[in-house]
């Protein structure tokens, strides 16, 4: 049966035993800046092109044992959430992966900047259709990372990022705090903000909307046909990247402002229990859970 | 995220160092009164001192970025410091990534075309 997260983002008129839109997002390229990925996993084979871009710091600790499946875990899962064959949002979207996070899931602002620059140069060399950039990472507030995101957004690229898993104001983190970026918080099957250990999803006025981000079934790098459940604002951001890819595939001329407006318009309103957020943040945090549009044109969003 | 907000740095640290244009006899010294700023991550464990992104003013060309980077290396060498240019940015932001001692920040902030300098920091999978 359909996983809860795919059911949650699907408009009622499309609900069935299966998540039906089979080829959504086919005109869009989604760039993923994350860990390495298992590119031949059954969920994503042929859907993800691994670029030769790699800029990662060395792993911490002298006794760190580099295990391939662990190195690929985060990125493989997210690629599956965006475009996976069985459990993906935008099954028709093609992806390109850049490695900016090491085997411990750690990267640098500088490495991320060089990755964003790589995307811009690729766009200039070979202009394609609409581009979505997924940044499932967060660091402290960074003026330079926010500036780079702003420049890329002004070049017509849609950037989607994780709000962060620190149960804190997203405005204190980057790229979550960049105004031009679509910043995504995480909710669970009960439409509650996601708790992650002692922490949880970030919140506040720098968050644009929320999306499913707890117990998300997706590709596991443990084996080529394995699935695993993962949680976090990265998973939430991957849902929105998939939804954005489908919207842009249906309407390639959408501006960032129009896309943002559509994402907000089609979101479920006032379903999140705001009591989870600190009192001073409740009014600032958007009570929106992302969803696909109930297309007025048959198959508009599912071509 | 969330368009329409003013930039809020939170508890983000900012060090403003006034430029003394006469120092080092810079041929392309900035206009009087402009200041380049230094930024670093407010979360101490995430800081990566020793690597800095030098961001140049918006209209700076690649050749000027390269020249500024070389100038920094030359001036640092005269003071007995080794530096390494790790990457020259162009396409999104003009600037360069440099591995150097924090002792050279004051010198770097006085270079022509410099808008601000940010110490590198960590980002994490979410």
């Amino acid at each position: 049966s359909i996983p809860w997260n795919l059911e949650r983002i699907t408009p009622p008129r499309y609900r069935a035993d299966e998540y039906q839109p089979p080829d959504g997002g086919s005109l869009v390229e989604v760039y993923l800046l994350d860990t390495s990925i298992q590119s031949d996993h059954r969920e994503i084979e042929g859907r993800v092109m691994v670029t030769d871009f790699e800029n990662v710091p060395e792993e911490d600790g002298t006794r760190f044992h580099r295990q391939a499946s662990k190195c690929d875990s985060h990125g493989t899962h997210l690629a599956g959430v965006v475009s996976g064959r069985d459990a993906g949002v935008a099954k028709g979207a093609s992806m390109r992966s850049l490695r900016v996070l090491n085997c411990q899931g750690k990267g640098t602002v500088s490495g991320t900047l060089i990755g964003l620059e790589f995307i811009r140069k690729s766009q200039l060399v070979q202009p394609v259709g609409p581009l979505v950039v997924l940044l499932p990472l967060a660091g402290g507030y960074s003026r330079v990372l926010n500036a780079a995101c702003q420049r890329l957004a002004r070049a017509g690229v849609v950037l989607v990022t994780a709000a962060g898993n620190f149960r804190d104001d997203a405005c204190l983190y980057s790229p979550a705090s960049a105004p031009e970026v679509i910043t995504v918080g995480a909710t669970n099957a009960q439409d509650q903000p996601v708790t992650l250990g002692t922490l949880g999803t970030n919140f506040g006025r720098c968050v644009d909307l929320f999306a499913p981000g707890e117990d998300i079934i997706g590709a596991s790098s443990d084996c080529s046909t394995c699935f695993v459940s993962q949680s976090g604002t990265s998973q939430a951001a991957a849902h929105v990247a998939g939804i954005a890819a489908m919207m842009l595939s249906a309407e390639p001329e959408l501006t960032l402002a129009e896309l943002r407006q559509r994402l907000i318009h089609f979101s479920a309103k006032d379903v999140i229990n705001e009591a989870w957020f600190p009192e001073d943040q409740r009014v600032l945090t958007p009570n929106l859970v992302a969803a696909l549009p109930p297309s007025t044109h048959e198959n508009l969003y599912f071509q | 995220g969330a368009m329409g907000q003013e930039d809020e740095d939170g508890d983000y640290e900012e060090l403003v160092l006034a430029l003394r244009s006469e120092e080092d006899g810079l041929a392309e010294a900035p206009e009087h009164g402009t200041t380049a700023t230094f930024h670093r991550c407010a979360k101490d464990p995430w800081r990566l001192p020793g690597t800095y992104v030098v961001v140049l003013k918006e209209e700076t060309h690649l050749s000027q970025s390269e020249r500024t980077a070389r100038r920094l290396q030359a001036q640092a060498a005269r003071r007995g410091y080794l530096t390494k240019i790790l990457h020259v940015f162009h396409g999104l932001l003009p600037g360069f990534l440099v591995k150097m001692s924090g002792d050279l920040l004051e010198l770097a902030l006085k270079l022509p075309h410099v808008d601000y300098i940010e110490e590198d920091s960590s980002v994490f999978a979410q």
């Epitope: 035993d17 298992q38 590119s39 031949d40 993800v48 499946s69 028709g92 080529s224 046909t225 | -």
Partner: antibody, heavy 115, light 116 residues
């Protein structure tokens, strides 16, 4: 264009081993694993297993588990399938196919097991 | 795991249409099925993938527009319109099942299509 080119026909005695190669071209080798499928004379298709070109992980069909070894050489974009302890009912045409999608196939390698 | 059942033989006149059927065993109505064409003495060729919503993804390379698919309940159909002599082939269907160590690929027995 995408091509999978397999090694030539083999005649083997029962108990021997055979190693079939499959050289891929026209796509990024590590973006798709390699599936192996065989077809006995006049019969349908039988899946034998799959190998990851990315990390070498394998997934074998129960029927051949223990007798089959699949390997890859990414430097030459070549996949290999070795079948040991051959029996007469292993006589078949052996095919490699691209990934789980199996959207491109090799021309086949006839392996005859006969005493 | 699912069992895929195909009729052994089918025939159609030149220029006519024919629909080949692949039936999944009970309980597997949501499964995707791949269709393959195998001309005499040649290797299989991917035609297209089908589920209850119709085609999944795109057709195999060089597959003409005369080939189309449909899915309904446990049945997966491959229809060939305006049949040509080169369509005379064996047609196999296949499906993936399970995950991890339980993953298998199953194939139907194949249908031999004769062009009259």
């Amino acid at each position: 264009q995408v091509q999978l080119v397999q090694s030539g026909a083999e005649v083997k005695k029962p108990g021997a081993s055979v190693k079939v190669s499959c050289k891929a071209s026209g796509y990024t080798f590590t973006s798709y694993g390699i599936s192996w499928v065989r077809q006995a004379p006049g019969q349908g298709l039988e899946w034998m297993g799959w190998i990851s070109t990315y990390n070498g992980n394998t997934n074998y069909a129960q029927k051949v588990q223990g007798r089959v070894t699949m390997t890859t050489d990414t430097s030459t974009s070549t996949a290999y399938m070795e079948l040991r302890s051959l029996r007469s009912d292993d006589t078949a045409v052996y095919y490699c196919a691209r990934g789980y999608t199996r959207d491109y196939w090799g021309q086949g390698t006839l392996v005859t097991v006969s005493s | 795991q699912p069992v895929l059942t195909q009729p052994l033989f089918a025939s159609a006149s030149l220029g006519a249409s024919v629909t080949l059927t692949c039936t999944l065993s009970s309980g597997y109505s949501s499964y995707e099925v791949d269709w393959y064409q195998q001309r005499p003495g040649k290797g299989p060729r991917f035609v297209m993938r089908v589920d209850t919503g119709g085609i999944v993804g795109s057709k195999g390379e060089g597959i003409p527009d005369r080939f189309s698919v449909l899915g309904s309940g446990l049945n997966r159909y491959l229809t060939i319109k305006n049949i040509q002599e080169e369509d005379e082939s064996d047609y196999h269907c296949g499906a993936d099942h399970g995950s991890g160590t339980n993953f298998v690929v199953v194939f139907g027995g194949g249908t031999k299509l004769t062009v009259l």
